[in-house]
């Protein structure tokens, strides 16, 4: 069945943008003037997820890349990772659950809780340049909430 | 306050145009997935479709081909260009703005515009 | 396409009267259901999300259950300001999105 997508680029409530560093991996760090150009475009597809109350899921891949965030257990942690996909059955309305987020959204603020592993969120350092995790605390110091932007084609 | 304010409506002739628009205030539309939905002289609700960003708009089967939502974020403004206009496209047009993106609920709407199809 | 069928068209009743609307899907759609009231000549408002939220500033007599394909909407005590017309309506992410066809309350 068909899945209702968008385009969109993510800022976390620094303003830090997110971009690729590296193949498999994204880092945040502020950027202006043409360097947005830099930040990362996702797809953030609706997909199929366990109910609870004003959670949504969605999968987040890159767009026009056959890559998707996913959680795995990596050393015994949750990790968040880019993993590569054929591009023939992604995105689907029934996606694995390592590619599902629950995402929250109050205030214009959003959160992305990794359905496989509850309370774990998408997470960025206070400080620059430093790769995008999952993170398993809320309100500390890392960065759990985010800022979506469409993006004009 | 934020709210929305639809117009454009008015009469037109079978195969006609019109374009009808919606502006918001109280907040930007660039950040919001709005919705058209219409309502036939004492029908129900149809949904004709949503627009998140420019290439992303979902239709009504119906509405496919003839109906086109596109955005104005300069001017904060959403637009329904309906084309090859018919009798039974006879209806208040209202614009609504999605609650949550994806939660497919509309919790702010406009107050309507009306269009009259025929000859 | 889903389809969303509403039942009764219309129904009767009274202040301080319980009162039961129900949907129903022609396939499965989880919890993703809303519910609308709508006055003569005014827009729809959201009244219940997710099947059983209540959206902000709705009273508390509105409540709703279901998932998969039955759904209901109940008013507890039915007040003067109730009498109109409720839809329900599929929603989350999916391609298409129906309404039910409609409730009439009368008093």
């Known amino acids: 069945a068909p899945v209702r997508s968008l385009n969109c680029t993510l800022r976390d409530s620094q303003q830090k943008s997110l971009v690729m560093s590296g193949p498999y991996e994204l880092k945040a760090l502020h950027l202006q003037g043409q360097d947005m150009e830099q930040q990362v475009v996702f797809s953030m597809s609706f997909v199929q997820g366990e109910e609870s109350n004003d959670k949504i899921p969605v999968a987040l891949g890159l767009k026009e890349k056959n890559l998707y965030l996913s959680c795995v257990l990596k050393d015994d942690k949750p990790t968040l990772q880019l993993e590569s996909v054929d591009p023939k059955n992604y995105p689907k309305k029934k996606m694995e659950k390592r590619f599902v987020f629950n995402k929250i959204e109050i205030n214009n603020k959003l959160e992305f809780e990794s359905a496989q592993f509850p309370n774990w969120y998408i997470s960025t350092s206070q400080a620059e340049n430093m790769p995008v995790f999952l993170g398993g605390t809320k309100g500390g110091q890392d960065i759990t909430d985010f800022t979506m932007q469409f993006v004009s084609s | 306050e934020v709210q929305l304010v639809e117009s454009g409506g008015g009469n037109v002739q079978p195969g006609g145009s019109l374009r009808l628009s919606c502006t918001a205030s109280?907040?930007?539309?660039?950040?919001?997935?709005m919705a058209w939905v219409r309502q036939a002289p004492g029908k129900g609700l149809e949904w004709v479709g949503i627009?998140?960003?420019?290439?992303?708009?979902f239709y009504a089967s119906w509405a496919k081909g003839r109906f086109t939502i596109s955005r104005d974020n300069s001017k904060n403004t959403l637009y329904l260009q309906m084309n090859s206009l018919r009798a039974e496209d006879t209806a208040t047009y209202y614009c609504a703005r999605e609650r949550n993106i994806f939660s497919g609920d509309m919790a702010l709407w406009g107050q309507g515009t009306t269009v009259t199809v025929s000859s | 396409e889903i389809v969303m069928t509403q039942s009764p068209s219309t129904l009767s009743a009274s202040v301080g009267d319980r009162v039961t609307i129900t949907c129903q899907a022609s396939?499965?759609?989880?919890?993703?259901l809303s519910w609308y009231q709508q006055k003569p000549g005014k827009a729809p408002k959201l009244l219940i999300y997710?099947?059983?939220t209540l959206a902000s500033g709705v009273p508390s007599r509105f409540s709703g259950s279901g998932s998969g394909t039955e759904f209901t909407l109940t008013i507890s005590s039915l007040q003067p300001d109730d009498f109109a017309t409720y839809y329900c309506q599929n929603a989350g992410g999916g391609v298409s999105i129906a309404f039910g066809q409609g409730t009439k309350l009368t008093v």
């Open positions: 627009i998140y960003d420019s290439a992303s708009t």
């Open positions: 396939q499965s759609i989880s919890s993703w």
């Open positions: 997710k099947a059983s």
């Open positions: 109280g907040f930007s539309l660039s950040d919001a997935a």
